[in-house]
C-alpha cells in the first residue's frame, strides 16, 4: 500500500513543497514519484520512505507516488493547488466627465489569479459595494450599470479582487484597480443668454454679458466669448448653479460691418453656444459749413449740413429736400443773425436701430456801429442838483467804443450817476467807433434852474 504526505497542498505560484512517499512493505522493489516538476530527493534512512522537494510549482499538479511490493504495485496522488493574485485588475477607461441622468457602465477586467474558485471580483463606489461576482473566464469581466447622479460628483469607482484562502488556513488576498474618479455635470439644453448692443460705433466700447442657469458644477464651466476673431476676456461671477460673464468689447474701423458675437459654455464633454450679430458702424458727427463764420451785414451766407452718406439730415429742424445726407440754406446776414445757431441733426439707421448725431455752428455778423434815438436820446432836460444817469448805448459787432464830448474836451459821464450842474449843459458829440466804421450823434443836455418864489 502506497501513501503520500501531504495529500493536499496549497502553495504560492513558483513555490516549493516537500512530498513524502511511503510504502507499507519493508523491502519495496521500487518507490518513487512521478511528476513533471523539478524534483530533488532528500536522503533518509530506511527503504520504505522517500522525501522529495518539488520546486517551481507554476500550476496545479497531481504528483503520484508509486511503490512495487511483493504483494503488488500501488499508487497515491497528492494534490498541489497553486495560488496567485491577478496580474491585472483594471476598470475599462471612461471619460471622466459624465452627464447627470446617464447610465454609466462600469466594466472590470481581471487577468490571471488562482484558484478561481476562491477569486471574487467586487465593483465599488468609494467603500460601497455595487456588485460582487465570482471571477469567470479569462480575462474575467464583471460589469454594472450606474445611473449618474449629481451627488456622485467626485466619487471614486474601483474594482477589487478577493482571493479568499482563509478556509485553507491562509489569508484573504486583495488587489485593487486604479480608481476612476467620476466628474458629474449638468449642462442645460437651453443655450446661454447673450445680452449685447445690436450696434456698436467704431472706437467705442460696449459691454457684453453672457449668462446661463442650471449648471453643475458651475465652477467647472468654461466660458468663451468672442466678437469675430477677437477673443474677449470676461469677468465671470458665479451663483449656486449659474454664472454671468461680463466683458468689455472695443471696436475699430477694421471691424466695421456685421460681426458674429459668440458665447460658448463648455462643461464636461458638452457645450452650448449662442450666436448674435453685432453691426459695427462708423458715424462721424455731421458737418455744419458756413461760407464764412464771420460776415458783414448784408452778405449772402450759405449754410451747408453734410453727414454720413446713408444718414438723413435736418438743418435747424427742417428736413433735407430731397431726404438725404445734405441740406443747405441761403440767407442775407442781418444784425439779428449775429450769434444765430445753425444746428445739423443727422439720423443714421444701422441694422434697424436709429443713431442720432448733431453739430451746431454759430454765425457772427459784423455790423454797426449804431446810435439811435431809442438807445441814445438826442435831448435830455434835467433839473439842476438832481441825480441823473446819462444813458447812451451804441450798438454793433464788434461792440463800438463810445465817447460823448462837449467842445471836443468835456466828457459826458455815460452810465454814471451825476449831480446835475450848470456845467453839464450843452451839446455833446457822441462818437461810436469800431472796426466796422464810425457814427456820430449830437446829444443836448438842458439844465433847469430852480424857481425861487
Amino acid at each position: 500500500q502506497t501513501s503520500v504526505s501531504p495529500s493536499k497542498v496549497i502553495l504560492p505560484r513558483g513555490g516549493s513543497v516537500l512530498v513524502t512517499c511511503s510504502t507499507s512493505c519493508d523491502q519495496p522493489k521500487l518507490l518513487g514519484i512521478e511528476t513533471p516538476l523539478p524534483k530533488k530527493e532528500l536522503l533518509l534512512p530506511g527503504n520504505n520512505r522517500k522525501v522529495y522537494e518539488l520546486s517551481n510549482v507554476q500550476e496545479d499538479s497531481q504528483p503520484m507516488c508509486y511503490s512495487n511490493c511483493p504483494d503488488g504495485q500501488s499508487t497515491a496522488k497528492t494534490f498541489l493547488t497553486v495560488y496567485w493574485t491577478p496580474e491585472r485588475v483594471e476598470l475599462a477607461p471612461l471619460p471622466s466627465w459624465q452627464p447627470v441622468g446617464k447610465n454609466l457602465t462600469l466594466r472590470c477586467q481581471v487577468e490571471g489569479g488562482a484558484p478561481r474558485a476562491n477569486l471574487t471580483v467586487v465593483l465599488l463606489r468609494g467603500e460601497k459595494e455595487l456588485k460582487r461576482e465570482p471571477a469567470v473566464g479569462e480575462p474575467a469581466e464583471v460589469t454594472t450599470t450606474v445611473l449618474v447622479r449629481r451627488d456622485h460628483h467626485g466619487a471614486n469607482f474601483s474594482c477589487r479582487t478577493e482571493l479568499d484562502l482563509r478556509p485553507q488556513g491562509l489569508e484573504l488576498f486583495e488587489n485593487t484597480s486604479a480608481p476612476y474618479q467620476l466628474q458629474t455635470f449638468v449642462l442645460p439644453a437651453t443655450p446661454p443668454q447673450l445680452v449685447s448692443p445690436r450696434v456698436l460705433e467704431v472706437d467705442t466700447q460696449g459691454t457684453v454679458v453672457c449668462s446661463l442657469d442650471g449648471l453643475f458644477p458651475v465652477s467647472e464651466a468654461q466660458v468663451h466669448l468672442a466678437l469675430g476673431d477677437q477673443r474677449l476676456n470676461p469677468t465671470v461671477t458665479y451663483g449656486n448653479d449659474s454664472f454671468s460673464a461680463k466683458a468689455s468689447v472695443s471696436v475699430t474701423a477694421e471691424d466695421e460691418g456685421t460681426q458674429r458675437l459668440t458665447c460658448a459654455v463648455i462643461l464636461g464633454n458638452q457645450s452650448q453656444e449662442t450666436l448674435q450679430t453685432v453691426t459695427i458702424y462708423s458715424f462721424p458727427a455731421p458737418n455744419v459749413i458756413l461760407t464764412k463764420p464771420e460776415v458783414s451785414e448784408g452778405t449772402e451766407v450759405t449754410v451747408k449740413c453734410e453727414a454720413h452718406p446713408r444718414a438723413k439730415v435736418t438743418l435747424n429742424g427742417v428736413p433735407a429736400q430731397p431726404l438725404g445726407p445734405r441740406a443747405q440754406l441761403l440767407l442775407k446776414a442781418t444784425p439779428e443773425d449775429n450769434g444765430r445757431s445753425f444746428s445739423c441733426s443727422a439720423t443714421l439707421e444701422v441694422a434697424g436701430q436709429l443713431i442720432h448725431k448733431n453739430q451746431t455752428r454759430e454765425l457772427r455778423v459784423l455790423y454797426g456801429p449804431r446810435l439811435d434815438e431809442r438807445d441814445c436820446p438826442g435831448n435830455w432836460t434835467w433839473p439842476e442838483n438832481s441825480q441823473q444817469t446819462p444813458m447812451c448805448q451804441a450798438w454793433g459787432n464788434p461792440l463800438p467804443e463810445l465817447k460823448c464830448l462837449k467842445d471836443g474836451t468835456f466828457p459826458l459821464p455815460i452810465g454814471e450817476s451825476v449831480t446835475v450842474t450848470r456845467d453839464l449843459e450843452g451839446t455833446y458829440l457822441c462818437r461810436a467807433r469800431s472796426t466796422q466804421g464810425e457814427v456820430t450823434r449830437k446829444v443836448t443836455v438842458n439844465v433847469l434852474s430852480p424857481r425861487y418864489e
Epitope: T314, L315, N316, G317, A351, G352, L354, H356, N358
Partner: antibody
C-alpha cells in the same frame, strides 16, 4: 395722405399669399413702412419694416415666414407658407417721422390703413 | 433688443374715473415712445407720440409722461368710448428680432 391694404382673402394652408399696401399723397422713397397684424384674441404684432432704400428687418418670429418688398407706390407683404396661426387682420403703417425740436428722425406709426383680413383654413 | 413690458394687462374703471397704464422698456429709448388706442374692427389710433405730445384731434384727457425706460399713459375723466385696448410702442429700433409693441392693456369701462 393715406395708406390702404388689399389682397386679404381665405387661403388654404401652404398657399402663398401677397398683401399690397398702396400709399397716396406721399412718396415711399422718403418713408419707412411697417406691417403689423392682429390675430383674433391677440395683441398687435409687428411683422417687419422696409426702409426708404429697400432694406428690410423682421420680428424674430416672422423671419422666413414673411417677405416685404416695394415698388414706387406700393409695399407688398408675402406670407410664404400660411398656417392657421396666420389668420389675422393685417395693417400697413407709415413708420417714419422727424422731431423738429431735435431735428432727429424716429420710428413713428403715424398713418395706418384700415386693415385687410386673411383667413387660413383647410 | 428693446422689450416693452406693459402693466396692467387689464383694468376696470368707472365712468369719470382715472386710469393709469405703465410701460417699461428694457433699455433706454429716450422719449421715442407712442401710445395707441385700438378698438375691434378699426386700425389703431395714435394718441401720444414722443412720450408726451398729444396727437392732433386727440382729447386732452389723454396724457403721456416719462422718458428713458419708464412711461405712463393717464386717462382722466374716463368716458365709455375709451373702452379699448391700449398699446405702447417704441420708436427707437426696428432691428431684426425686435419687440416694438407692449403686450397691451384692456380698459373696461363700467
Amino acid at each position: 395722405q393715406s395708406v390702404e391694404e388689399s389682397g386679404g382673402r381665405l387661403v388654404t394652408p401652404g398657399t402663398p399669399l401677397t398683401l399690397t399696401c398702396t400709399a397716396s399723397g406721399f412718396s415711399l422713397s422718403n418713408y419707412y413702412m411697417s406691417w403689423v397684424r392682429q390675430a383674433p384674441g391677440k395683441g398687435l404684432e409687428w411683422i417687419g419694416i422696409i426702409s426708404d432704400s429697400g432694406s428690410t428687418y423682421y420680428a424674430s418670429w416672422a423671419k422666413g415666414r414673411f417677405t416685404i418688398s416695394k415698388t414706387s407706390t406700393t409695399v407688398d407683404l408675402k406670407i410664404t407658407s400660411p398656417t392657421t396661426e396666420d389668420t389675422a387682420t393685417y395693417f400697413c403703417a407709415r413708420d417714419w417721422s422727424y422731431d423738429s425740436s431735435s431735428g432727429y428722425y424716429y420710428y413713428d406709426m403715424d398713418l395706418w390703413g384700415p386693415g385687410t383680413l386673411v383667413t387660413v383654413s383647410a | 433688443g428693446y422689450d416693452m413690458t406693459q402693466t396692467p394687462a387689464s383694468v376696470e374703471v368707472a365712468v369719470g374715473g382715472t386710469v393709469t397704464i405703465k410701460c417699461q422698456a428694457s433699455q433706454s429709448i429716450n422719449s421715442w415712445l407712442a401710445w395707441f388706442q385700438h378698438k375691434p374692427g378699426q386700425p389703431p389710433k395714435r394718441l401720444i407720440y414722443k412720450a408726451s405730445t398729444l396727437a392732433s384731434g386727440v382729447s386732452s384727457r389723454f396724457k403721456g409722461s416719462g422718458s428713458g425706460t419708464q412711461f405712463t399713459l393717464t386717462i382722466s375723466g374716463v368716458e365709455s368710448a375709451d373702452a379699448a385696448t391700449y398699446y405702447c410702442q417704441q420708436g427707437y429700433s426696428r432691428s431684426d428680432g425686435e419687440h416694438v409693441f407692449g403686450g397691451g392693456t384692456e380698459v373696461v369701462v363700467k
